[in-house]
């Protein structure tokens, strides 16, 4: 019988008492085969973290700073359940740490040196740890003691709870630096008052502070937020302009064998029986013998953290950077305006080989990082392990939802000013063999399908979106008799036609021979009835243009396109017979790397782009024997985006809407994780 006990870790007598009450009340409402609670008492949260790692306990609720400690080796814990605040309809699991300034003050984030600062309190998250952690490498050396470095960075501050004797500048704006509400500038509202009164130039607070202190929109309009990209935004645009997004209070468990499903089952049932306004005799979110025992008193309920989310993703790049800076205190030798090497994310070993060659030729400008799937690469860019990669539009959508930004677009047509003119896009098509003359768009049911990969534009999002509108369900594996759609569940009929061997079967990378445009076309040639690809795929792999044995004798005339009106047309008539226009592939990165990625890639394409004529004796960035490694092989240049610099603007309203509609069919664990952070 599986052990269905969750051993909860308590850190005080009062918590242990509440835990025992929790245990007894759960016993009274949950059947004997359901989850149960046991209580383990430890002296501190860090002891609880160690106990969970050592399998002596299973769960504890922590604030963000401790979630970071819990994630560090050797603990390796992960977030599994989040407390939420506000309403069930609009649950808040995160708050945003922001830098608020007066509208007319005219300086940016990178011009804070010499300004006067207002903090909620020394050592507090939004008011100190996050802003000072992010500014850490700009502080004057020596950076220890930290208070002295901060005092020398700003021209005056109010940092309640600081030592006013040793660091008088930190108390200059609030004499005495009192550590309670007796100090008018203490806490969130106090720090904001410090700004409002004109004592300080910037206040480091939570996003909600401004709304709690200024009910009137006209008053709020006198303030702005400083963004990390050295711009400003209105105070209600905090989701796009903050220092960090911080989880409020989170249950953590072991990463391996951590009972996360059991913990969720327990807490979900607990909130049903003992949540807000549920029971008089025991309340989960109430602490008669103290404050915030086991859970925050202000919590309204629990949400399950998506399984794909590790602590780094949950805490977010900015928060992790800030805390790591404060804890480790390491900075680059001397901050320069020079760009660091761009860490390119390569999929599997074929892309890695090309990336390595690029890296050797780039003379220190490009480094390589490997991952097995596109989603793993996106996750690595999010957390700073990698910086950039070029993505199909479907993944630009996911990357955008995860906070990444497009920076350059692949262009496929030769033109005089290629780099200045991003193209409208390419065509997504459905290709069939000419010999299968009865096949049309209207009778694809039961046929064998070939897709570039799940989640990609031409191979999945466009054809499956159109199909979904017709069949109104997501069971595409039942619609087609079999197929190859790399990235599908291994036991799905949409992996049946794939050719990868062993663990590589149906993998969404080049180890699966039917992956990508060329792979999907090969699948049609060898096994399938229809392939969903781009309009250039057939000409690029016929007429001897692809020398691989399977392709070298193919003739473009032996293939036709399916049109949405039920007719068929020759391959060259794609402009009048396609499924939809698809946005070109684009390079994505984190916002903080945008300028450097842009600069370095433009240099790199001038050295190794399509101006290189002899690819047998030189490195060519846009060539890989029709395998589209790192970039599509038909890329002519990487073009500036001008104002299309967000994923929504880049992909266009129509495509974003189409992918949004397909979301209900999404199997993307990363998309689920990212929409948890930003619904």
């Amino acid at each position: 019988v599986p052990d269905k006990t969750v051993r909860w870790c308590a850190v005080s007598e009062h918590e242990a008492t509440k835990c025992q009450s929790f245990r007894d009340h759960m016993k009274s409402v949950i059947p004997s085969d359901g989850p149960s609670v046991a209580c383990v008492k430890k002296a501190s949260y860090l002891d609880c973290i160690r106990a969970i790692a050592a399998n002596e306990a299973d769960a504890v609720t922590l604030d963000a700073g401790l979630v970071y400690d819990a994630y560090l080796a050797p603990n390796n814990l992960k977030p599994v359940v989040a407390e939420f605040y506000g309403s069930k309809e609009d649950p808040q699991t995160f708050y945003y740490a922001v830098a608020v300034v007066k509208k007319d003050s005219g300086f940016q984030m990178n011009q804070l040196r010499g300004k006067k600062s207002c903090h909620t309190g020394l050592g507090r998250s939004a008011g100190w740890n996050i802003p000072i952690g992010l500014l850490y490498c700009d502080l004057p050396e020596p950076r220890k003691p930290l208070e002295k470095a901060v005092a020398n960075f700003f021209s005056g501050s109010c940092a309640p709870c600081a030592d006013g004797t040793d660091f008088p500048q930190l108390c200059q704006l609030c004499p005495g630096c009192g550590c309670s509400t007796l100090n008018q500038y203490f806490g969130y509202s106090g720090a904001f008052k410090c700004l409002k009164d004109g004592a300080g130039d910037v206040a480091f607070v939570k996003h909600s502070t401004i709304f709690e202190n200024l009910a009137n929109k006209a008053d709020r309009d006198q303030y702005e937020l400083l963004c990390l990209d050295n711009t400003r935004k209105p105070v209600d645009e905090y989701k796009d302009c903050h220092l960090a997004q911080v989880p409020s209070h989170t249950v953590v468990a072991r990463s391996m064998g951590g009972k996360e499903d059991l913990i969720w089952e327990l807490l979900n049932q607990a909130q049903e029986h003992f949540g807000k306004d549920k029971s008089k005799e025991f309340q989960l979110f109430s602490s008669p013998h103290g404050k915030d025992l086991l859970f925050k008193d202000s919590a309204h309920g629990f949400l399950k953290v998506p399984p794909r989310m590790d602590a780094k993703m949950y805490l977010g790049y900015e928060y992790v950077t800030a805390i790591r800076n404060l804890r480790e205190g390491t900075c680059p030798e001397a901050p320069t305006d020079e760009c660091k090497p761009v860490k390119w994310c390569a999929l599997s070993h074929h892309e890695r080989l090309k990336c390595d060659e690029w890296s050797v030729n780039s003379v220190g400008k490009i480094e390589c990082v490997s991952a097995e799937t596109t989603e793993d690469c996106i996750a690595k860019i999010m957390n700073g392990e990698a910086d950039a990669m070029s993505l199909d539009g479907g993944f630009v959508y996911i990357a955008g939802k995860c906070g990444l930004v497009p920076v350059l677009a692949e262009n496929y047509n030769k033109s005089d000013n290629c780099e200045d003119t991003p193209e409208a896009g390419y065509f997504a098509i459905a290709v069939v063999k000419k010999s299968a003359s009865d096949l049309t768009w209207d009778n694809l049911k039961g046929k064998k399908s070939c897709h570039t990969a799940v989640g990609r534009t031409a191979g999945w999002n466009i054809p499956m979106g159109l199909l979904y509108n017709k069949i109104n369900h997501c069971r595409f594996d039942e619609f087609f008799s079999e197929g190859c759609a790399p990235g599908s569940k291994k036991d799905s009929s949409l992996c049946k036609l794939c050719m990868g061997s062993g663990l590589n079967l149906c993998e969404p990378n080049n180890k699966e021979g039917y992956y990508g445009y060329t792979g999907a076309f090969r699948c049609l040639v060898e096994k399938g009835d229809v392939a969903f690809v781009k309009h250039q795929t057939v000409p690029q792999n016929t007429g001897g243009k692809n020398p691989d044995p399977w392709a070298k004798n193919l003739n473009e005339k032996d293939y036709e396109l399916l049109c949405l009106d039920g007719t068929r047309k020759p391959v060259e008539e794609y402009a009048n017979c396609h499924l939809a226009r698809a946005p070109n592939h684009a390079v994505v990165t984190r916002k903080d790397k945008e300028a450097c990625v842009h600069k370095i890639l433009r240099q790199q394409q001038h050295l190794f782009g399509s101006n290189v004529t002899d690819c047998s004796g030189n490195f060519c960035l846009f060539r890989s024997e029709t395998k589209d490694l790192l970039f599509r092989d038909d890329t002519v240049c990487l073009a500036k985006l001008h104002d299309r610099n967000t994923y929504e603007k880049y992909l266009g309203e129509e495509y974003v809407k189409a992918v949004g509609n397909l979301r209900k069919c999404s199997t993307s664990s990363l998309l689920e994780a990212c929409t948890f952070r930003r619904p």
Partner: nanobody, 117 residues
């Protein structure tokens, strides 16, 4: 297509040195990029060092300051001088010129380097 044959590996004590050679069956003067990779048991193959025709080089962080890559176009040979060897340098070492493309999984026999006391 140029064939490449690696040699020079062997058993060496920690702190010792080895010089690996990679002899090409034809001219390497026109080959842009050449590189040494290594693969330890149960690990992915990783880039150790690379060199371009113009002589610019790149090294993995783990070997910087200890290993030196060079090429002699007249002798059609690529070299890897390995000093201050450590047990974690134990692996099979391969050379490549990338000319077979990134997709063909063709690698030579390689040469085994074992660093152990």
């Amino acid at each position: 297509e140029v064939q490449l044959v690696e040699c020079g590996g062997g058993l060496v004590q920690p702190g010792g040195s080895l010089r690996l050679s990679c002899a090409a069956s034809g001219s390497i003067a026109g080959i842009n990029t050449m590189a040494w990779y290594r693969q330890a048991p149960g690990q992915q193959r990783e880039l150790v060092a690379g060199i371009t025709r113009s002589g610019s080089t790149k090294y993995a962080d783990s070997v910087k300051g200890r290993f030196t890559i060079s090429r002699d176009n007249a002798k059609n040979t690529l070299y890897l001088q390995m000093n201050s060897l450590k047990p974690e340098d134990t692996a099979v070492y391969y050379c490549t010129d990338y000319s077979r493309g990134y997709y063909q999984d063709y690698w030579g026999q390689g040469t085994q380097v074992t660093v152990s006391s």
